[in-house]
Interface confidence: medium
Amino acid sequence: MRWCLLLIWAQGLRQAPLASGMMTGTIETTGNISAEKGGSIILQCHLSSTTAQVTQVNWEQQDQLLAICNADLGWHISPSFKDRVAPGPGLGLTLQSLTVNDTGEYFCIYHTYPDGTYTGRIFLEVLESSVAEHGARFQIPLLGAMAATLVVICTAVIVVVALTRKKKALRIHSVEGDLRRKSAGQEEWSPSAPSPPGSCVQAEAAPAGLCGEQRGEDCAELHDYFNVLSYRSLGNCSFFTETG
């Protein structure tokens, strides 16, 4: 999915793998992002590498609930954020009329079955207009310097590896044929590099009710929450995971 790559900074795609051995999924997020005061930003998270069914996605800022996208009920935007938060695109969230107070951590919480809860973190920094421009001017030379340093390091590593291999080749010349046979066999089962976003197989996740691990809330409370608040659903959320 290309959309999960929107607004990604030079630091690249952030991944939040989970500690539990049973939970194989990974949340990809837009990482650390910055935006100008008064502007807008799209927060994006993407759950991949699991066949678990997504039942609900919560968007939170620190401990405040911004929005919920529920498999059965669709979108709900918290009343206090309704004027500045727009649903989408996809499972993302569009934040508008940004203020410096919007700086901070944002979390996408995927409630899934049977895996449980996956959480992705995004850090948003809202800058004064002039600061944002200033930062952008310095970012490009910095990236250039980083790239140059990387090239030098890579070259050095390649040279060292090549020299080491040359020495080893002299030492193990007698078993070369044997190793070749082994490596040829290995190629058949060795996992290939992860597919880039957008080329993964897509598994549609069917709605599986409201209950995930709702952070200190039990299922009854969650149902009450939906009953109390003005919940508008004009179409379903785009729940899916990508296996990869």
């Epitope: 999915m1 957008g198 080329s199 004009l234 379903n236 899916f240």
Partner: antibody
Framework: QVQLQQSGPELVKPGASVKISCKAS????????INWVKQRPGQGLEWIGW????????YFNEKFKGKATLTVDKSSSTVYMLLSSLTSEDSAVYFC???????????WGQGTTLTVSS | EIVLTQSPALMAASPGEKVTITCSVS???????LHWYQQKSETSPKPWIY???NLASGVPIRFSGSGSGTSYSLTISSMEAEDAATYYC?????????FGGGTKLEIK
């Protein structure tokens, strides 16, 4: 169900500006995202952007930033699109289309034909 | 931006014939975010199929939609004269929202 009623056809000169309107009825107008879509003669559809009447917040296709300005008059449940510095490339039918918290344009206005000609 | 490519651009079908229109997406999207609209000349588009396979209100059941990832299609099981129109696919997966170039379907 929301009904969207657009203003009539416009004939304007190059370099001028024009303001077209889209009046909504039959729904909680402030909870509805009003989008604008451009269709040049014999061609496909191009998304311009949306306005959320509840707050007046807008989101634009980069291509139309500086060309289109979206505003709302909550008292009359009307959204306006101002197109500026008009050229022949802006000659098209402009549709307003709405979506709620769903993903697709479930309602469309009848379209406003804009002709830019000297 | 996500590019949607429809094929064929123009086609004609006889009454009773099965018709399939395809929409190829430049990068994989969730099927919940792919929609189809029908437009007849001199009128505004109408929602036709949303979320890949859900028929909008009033759409005849001879229409169906399917697909996933980067490949989607709209099918008419048995073409009727009133189905002659231009059909557009559209994505809501990322901004800017984009439409396919359209498939003009004519009756033979």
């Amino acid at each position: 169900q929301v009904q969207l009623q657009q203003s009539g056809p416009e004939l304007v000169k190059p370099g001028a500006s024009v303001k077209i309107s889209c009046k909504a009825s039959g729904h909680t107008f402030t909870d509805y995202y009003i989008n604008w879509v451009k269709q040049r003669p014999g061609q496909g559809l191009e998304w311009i952007g949306w306005i959320f009447p509840g707050s007046g917040n807008t989101y634009f296709n980069e291509k139309f930033k500086g060309k289109a300005t979206l505003t709302v008059d909550k008292s009359s449940s009307t959204v306006y699109m101002l197109l500026s510095s008009l050229t022949s490339e802006d000659s098209a039918v402009y549709f307003c289309a709405g979506y709620g918290l769903g993903h697709y344009f479930d309602n469309w206005g009848q379209g406003t034909t804009l002709t830019v000609s000297s | 931006e996500i590019v949607l490519t429809q094929s064929p651009a123009l086609m004609a079908a006889s009454p009773g014939e099965k018709v399939t229109i395809t929409c190829s997406v430049s990068s994989s999207i969730s099927s919940s975010n792919l929609h189809w609209y029908q437009q007849k000349s001199e009128t505004s588009p109408k929602p036709w199929i949303y979320g890949t396979s859900n028929l909008a209100s009033g759409v005849p059941i001879r229409f169906s939609g399917s697909g996933s990832g980067t490949s989607y299609s709209l099918t008419i099981s048995s073409m009727e004269a009133e189905d002659a129109a231009t059909y557009y696919c559209q994505q809501w997966s990322s901004y800017p929202l984009t439409f396919g170039g359209g498939t003009k379907l004519e009756i033979k």
